[in-house]
């Protein structure tokens, strides 16, 4: 058993049929010794007597909260939530797998650029008896600070018959240089408790790994007297890291109809401009991505051809 | 410790072009490590992030663009002296931080390349034969580092009377080479800067 | 599947036109660029022009500006290279080719042969 | 026009061993640059798109890299189909223009 937080406790439980659970010894936070009574949430059923209660936890009927009370009065509260470990590992029932990029990934961050800004986000089908904390740090071992906000719901879904809620969380890295060269990876720690359940997600990533610019801006075309080319030239997103000659992107110029199955033009270039060939009913696309360390493109910027 | 603006001329800046294959020869070198030894630890989430110029050189403080020096995090107190003349520098106006910035690149290229050259003796002899350091990145370093063009003492090659360890010179290589590459990466900024200043 | 079928190789005079074509099987013709390149003997290869079937643009090689005409007909799924005021240095395979990505070629036909001698 | 210079023009390698070889653009072409084989009597055949992409069917012996103005085909360890004239082709812009192309032979 550990604290979560003041009067919030995790019980860690081997989840199998018949497992012994846990004897967890609850101490009334108090300076009175006798008279003391103990309940369970809004049951008024008397589960003991005394300064301490040893109950044994065993399954999620046991864990909820406790309290202590003398002559009617409530003296302390001890929340008590369940962490499971089935066949050795920890339970991720309350998160979604988003199997990007690979399987078992429940949190991805992202960010715009080097300022030691980024953006975490993960799904859940729940919708109730929710709640989330997010810490993150660089390294572990001693580790620098990073400053993650509130996670708030970012998104809801209709998959199918279900509704999939996003949640997201910002972080900045207290003293991030934006020219530094990564060693020490950073760390994102999730706690997640659905009702009584507690679950934990880790992230680590270095920040140049999850680099993904806004889309190029300002896209512009320019016809070609006595040619169907086109001139499209754009500027780098606003969320760029500067100055753009140490942080220089990369860009793919495609024409493509509304059909990803229809024929294109497809350009990559270092400038901020390039010529293509237009047609009818198609759209100029520009992404833009880091052009010396290859993580992720941008999503597209578009204008149509006409 | 800084790059100012007044650099050399657009097109007058040979290094560009080396560095530009230095980082395409890295990044290839690192893939085929990648591939061969899929066995071994070798991804970056595996490897430990070990920089064998830490303490050594300065690359990023020397090199940091003006733009940057503003913000404290970037401004770190080591200290290291340079030799200065190389041919990059191909303006007289050239200051005496940029000449820092490219001597510390050229330290850094020296140091890794006797590092690479000691571990691909070991390599060699490895009856597995399972992987060699490709020539053309040696070869791309050497280069970039004659157009750098710094007088330097020469590092002597370390030699090692013990029977090498293919296993840990293996997961040393995927180490190597993943801190070489980011360096790379920084170096190729660095010179795009200057080119573009 | 998708297939190019040239025409048979051909013989010409300096000074007269060659028009060659190109059936094409296997997806939707006008979903497709064709290209067409050449080949002198033991040489390298040369691009001439594309041509849009979907809606007739072309592009050709400056170098052959004014010199080709390439077509396409829809109905056939065939499309046609024409080289006008040939020169014996004109003598090459002429290869069509196709691909759904404008600037580079993925299906090649087998080629055909045009000689131009007096 | 962007010039392509594939080097060497004759590359003769021993069944096993491997090859590279390399093409230069007279000016930048970002990735834009396409691989080709071509075997005698043969129209040509796509191996490699925008540098470095492979293309399915392509055996992956065959890779390549490179950007800006210096790329590379290489051909991990030849195999004696792998005997061919290999191009290759810019598209960054019109018109498209092909190297002179290099003649894999057997040493």
């Known amino acids: 058993i550990w604290e979560l937080k003041k009067d919030v406790y995790v019980v860690e439980l081997d989840w199998y049929p018949d497992a012994p659970g846990e004897m967890v010894v609850l101490t009334c936070d108090t300076p009175e010794e006798d008279g003391i009574t103990w309940t369970l949430d809004q049951s008024s059923e008397v589960l003991g007597s005394g300064k301490t209660l040893t109950i044994q936890v065993k399954e999620f009927g046991d864990a909820g909260q406790y309290t202590c009370h003398k002559g009617g009065e409530v003296l302390s509260h001890s929340l008590l939530l369940l962490h499971k470990k089935e066949d050795g590992i920890w339970s991720t029932d309350i998160l979604k797998d988003q199997k990007e990029p690979k399987n078992k990934t429940f949190l991805r961050c992202e960010a715009k650029n080097y300022s030691g800004r980024f953006t975490c986000w993960w799904l859940t089908t729940i919708s109730t008896d929710l709640t989330f904390s997010v810490k993150s740090s660089r390294g572990s071992s001693d580790p620098q600070g990073v400053t993650c906000g509130a996670a708030t719901l970012s998104a809801e879904r209709v998959r199918g018959d279900n509704k999939e809620y996003e949640y997201s969380v910002e972080c900045q890295e207290d003293s991030a240089c934006p020219a530094a060269e990564e060693s020490l990876p950073i760390e994102v720690m999730v706690d997640a408790v659905h009702k009584l359940k507690y679950e934990n997600y880790t992230s680590s990533f270095f920040i140049r790994d999850i680099i993904k610019p806004d889309p190029p801006k300002n896209l512009q075309l320019k016809p070609l007297k006595n040619s169907r080319q086109v001139e499209v030239s754009w500027e780098y997103p606003d969320t760029w890291s500067t100055p753009h000659s140490y942080f220089s992107l990369t860009f793919c110029v495609q024409v493509q109809g509304k059909s990803k199955r229809e024929k294109k033009d497809r350009v990559f270039t270092d400038k901020t401009s390039a010529t293509v060939i237009c047609r009818k009913n198609a759209s100029i696309s520009v992404r833009a991505q880091d052009r010396y360390y290859s993580s992720s493109w941008s999503e597209w910027a578009s204008v149509p051809c006409s | 410790r800084n790059l100012p603006v007044a650099t050399p001329d657009p097109g007058m800046f040979p290094c560009l072009h080396h560095s530009q294959n230095l980082l395409r020869a890295v990044s290839n070198m690192l893939q085929k490590a990648r591939q061969t030894l899929e066995f071994y630890p070798c991804t970056s989430e595996e490897i430990d992030h070990e920089d064998i110029t830490k303490d050594k050189t300065s690359t990023v403080e020397a090199c940091l663009p003006l733009e940057l020096t503003k913000n404290e995090s970037c401004l770190n107190s080591r200290e290291t002296s340079f030799i200065t003349n190389g041919s990059c520098l191909a303006s007289r106006k050239t200051s005496f931080m940029m000449a820092l910035c490219l001597s510390s690149i050229y330290e850094d290229l020296k140091m890794y390349q006797v590092e690479f050259k000691t571990m691909n003796a070991k390599l060699l002899m490895d009856p597995k034969r399972q992987i060699f350091l490709d020539q053309n990145m040696l070869a791309v370093i050497d280069e970039l580092m004659q157009a750098l063009n710094f007088n330097s003492e020469t590092v002597p090659q370390k030699s090692s009377l013990e029977e090498p360890d293919f296993y840990k010179t293996k997961i040393k290589l995927c180490i190597l080479l993943h801190a070489f590459r980011i360096r790379a990466v920084t170096i190729d900024r660095v010179m795009s800067y200057l080119n573009a200043s | 599947q998708v297939q190019l079928v040239q025409s048979g190789a051909e013989v010409k005079k300096p000074g007269s036109s060659v028009k060659v074509s190109c059936k094409a099987s296997g997806g939707t013709f006008s979903d497709y660029y064709l290209h067409w390149s050449r080949q002198a003997p033991g040489q390298g290869l040369e691009w001439m022009g594309w041509?849009?079937?979907?809606?007739?643009?072309?592009e050709y090689a400056p170098k052959f500006q004014g010199r080709v005409t390439i077509t396409a007909d829809e109905s056939t799924s065939t499309a046609y290279m024409e080289l006008s005021s040939l020169r014996s240095e004109d003598t090459a395979v002429y290869y069509c080719?196709?691909?759904?990505?404008?600037?580079?070629?993925?299906?090649w036909g087998q080629g055909t042969l045009v000689t131009v001698s007096s | 026009d962007i010039v392509m210079t594939q080097s060497p023009l004759s590359l003769p390698v021993t069944p096993g061993e491997p090859a590279s070889i390399s093409c230069r653009a007279s000016q930048s072409i970002s990735i834009n640059l396409h691989w080709y084989q071509q075997k005698p009597g043969q129209a040509p055949r796509q191996l490699i798109a925008?540098?470095?992409q492979s293309i399915s069917g392509v055996p992956s012996r065959f890779s390549g890299s490179g950007s800006g103005t210096d790329f590379t085909l290489t051909i991990s360890s030849l195999q004696p189909e792998d005997f061919a004239t290999y191009y290759c082709q810019q598209s960054n812009s019109f018109p498209l223009t092909f190297g002179q192309g290099t003649k894999v032979e057997i040493k």
């Open positions: 041509i849009d079937p979907e809606n007739g643009d072309t």
């Open positions: 925008f540098a470095s």
């Open positions: 080719a196709r691909n759904k990505e404008l600037r580079y070629i993925d299906v």
